[in-house]
């Protein structure tokens, strides 16, 4: 972004920012914008919240166009009302082991996080909390309407999930990598993060990747076949180019996206992989960003609940990154 030209702002008055989000000047000192928050995409024009000690981390010098809002080295984390030091590990509940790193929290589930899809022997799986047990377990409900169970169920299969091996040891380093977090946006381009020490120095580091669960403009409910309640992985008719803050992917991609349900279930990525995508900007600059690509999606009732911070973080997370 060239800041040498005259300042002109959008025709609307200054935006109203959500509670806790600062109203700041853009990176050119021109226009008032709502500051980007931890983990959000940022540019020179869309700066991070300085009152929370955030800066726009552009990664490699070649990518000085779009970054991710990152806390300064050593920044503490506020999680569930408690302040944790950077580098501190803590068990947030019996279900999660978490680590604070430079203002970001990465957690590894201590319970099985598999997604159970309907099958002939268990057509209505449901997770329930059993007395005296921390981790929820799957139970099979009886169908309310027998006519639903039929030959169509043969199309369902139980999908495995692949996560990092938490006990991997390499050269005196216990390699630990948290799951990729849920995509920050339910539609359109977002950010997914994780914490890992899978590097030469065995130091904890934050990794981020772009993600798109589904395009915002797609009206997916229209594609649900008659008699069905979900469209798990809708077919995208033509290859698409990804857009990121005015920059466009150099290649076209026949990407898979997750669909929607009409019965209250949510469809989320089940197996994913991470690949580099090159974006070309209007000024000719090329930048490379890692991006999540969906292999399979799952539709389930484990939708994020506002009442449970962990469920919202981890039931929607990207299972089994196969990169």
């Amino acid at each position: 972004q060239n800041c040498s030209g005259p300042c002109r702002c959008p025709d609307e008055p200054a935006p109203r920012c959500p509670a806790g989000v600062s109203l700041v000047l853009d990176g050119c000192g021109c226009c008032r914008v709502c500051a980007k928050q931890l983990g959000e995409l940022c540019t020179e024009r869309d700066p991070c919240d300085p009152h929370k000690g955030l800066f726009c981390d552009f990664g490699s010098p070649a990518n000085r166009k779009i970054g991710v809002c990152t806390a300064k080295d050593g920044a503490p984390c506020i999680f569930g009302g408690t302040v944790y030091r950077s580098g501190e590990s803590f068990q947030s509940s019996c279900k999660y082991q978490c680590t604070c790193l430079d203002g970001a929290v990465g957690c590894m589930p201590l319970c099985s996080m598999d997604v159970r899809l309907p099958s002939p022997d268990c057509p209505f799986p449901r997770r329930v909390k059993l007395p005296g047990k921390c981790c929820e377990e799957w139970v099979c409900d009886e169908p309310k309407d027998q006519t639903v169970v039929g030959p169509a169920l043969a199309a369902y299969r139980l999908e495995d999930t692949f996560g990092p091996d938490p006990t991997m040891i390499r050269a005196n380093c216990l390699v630990q990598t948290t799951e990729w977090s849920a995509c920050s946006k339910t539609c359109g381009m977002g950010i997914s993060t994780r914490v890992t020490n899978d590097n030469a120095s065995c130091r904890l580091e934050k990794q981020s990747r772009l993600c798109m669960v589904r395009p915002c403009e797609a009206d997916l409910e229209e594609n649900i076949k008659k008699g069905k309640k979900c469209i798990r992985t809708p077919k995208i008719s033509k290859p698409i180019k990804f857009e990121l803050s005015g920059c466009t992917s150099m290649k076209t991609y026949r990407a898979k996206f997750c669909g929607v349900c009409t019965d209250g279930r949510c469809c989320t990525p089940h197996r994913t992989t991470t690949l580099p995508v090159e974006f070309k900007c209007p000024d000719g600059e090329v930048m490379k960003k890692n991006m999540m690509f969906i292999k399979t999606c799952a539709c389930h009732y484990n939708c994020p609940g506002d009442n449970d911070i962990f469920e919202s973080l981890y039931y929607r997370k990207m299972y089994g990154d196969m990169a």
């Epitope: 300042c7 002109r8 702002c9 008055p13 000047l25 021109c30």
Partner: antibody, heavy 119, light 111 residues
């Protein structure tokens, strides 16, 4: 009523200094950029400088940058133009103007204050 | 960016149409893709007042007999039915590139 009132003009010798003030009323001052525009006797309009909402960014006519400074005090609803090393060619009526920073530039103007640089 | 106005003076009868041209030495499209071309009127003994902004948008309180048009480097201000109160000097102005610049002015007189 939206109003801009300039003051501080007068007769000054070449090499001297003046500080122009502009008092704003009738609008939320910190929601607008402010600007100075001048007009030499019998001549056209010339943009001098403008300043953003909080004073953290200022833009001035390149030829005046070393001698002129624009600033603002939002608590006092005022914008200022500090003019140093004045020359005869700086003789003009200096207008204070409100800059919307959005669609249009100068939607409200003051009546102007006259600066005469002469020995 | 040099803004050149023609004619430099214009004499019209009341009720007639007046047209003023403004040419810029280069394209005045801002990096945000808007064109910040404005027209100001300075009546005798008064401060300038905004008439038109962003090429063709009328400022608040400006009569609809004033209209602006153009693109790229060529712009025009038209007054469809000139009234006595319209006399004065008209300036075009570009705010897309530094330095912000005004045209030299067109003096409108009533015949």
């Amino acid at each position: 009523e939206v109003q801009l009132v300039e003051s501080g003009g007068g007769l000054v010798q070449p090499g001297g200094s003046l500080r122009l003030s502009c008092a704003a009323s009738g609008f939320t001052f910190s929601d607008y950029y402010m600007a100075w525009v001048r007009q030499a006797p019998g001549k056209g309009l010339e943009w001098v400088a403008n300043i953003n909402y909080y004073g953290s960014r200022t833009d001035l006519l390149a030829s005046l940058k070393s001698r002129f400074t624009i600033s603002r005090d939002n608590a006092k609803n005022s914008v200022y133009l500090q003019m140093n090393s004045l020359r005869a060619e700086d003789t003009a009526v200096y207008y204070c103007a409100r800059d919307t920073s959005r669609g249009s530039y100068f939607d409200v103007w003051g009546a102007g204050t006259t600066v005469t640089v002469s020995s | 960016v040099v803004m050149t106005q023609t004619p430099l003076s214009l004499s019209v009868s009341l009720g007639d149409q007046a047209s003023i041209s403004c040419k810029s030495s280069q394209s005045i499209v801002h990096y945000n893709e808007n064109t910040y071309l404005e027209w100001y009127l300075q009546k005798p003994g008064q401060s300038p007042q905004l008439l038109i902004y962003k090429v063709s948008s009328r400022a608040s309180g400006v009569p609809d007999r004033f209209s602006g048009s153009g693109s790229g480097t060529d712009f025009t201000l038209k007054i469809s039915r000139v009234e006595a109160e319209d006399l004065g000097v008209y300036y075009c102005f570009q705010g897309s590139h530094f330095p912000l610049t005004f045209g030299q002015g067109t003096k409108l007189e009533i015949k």
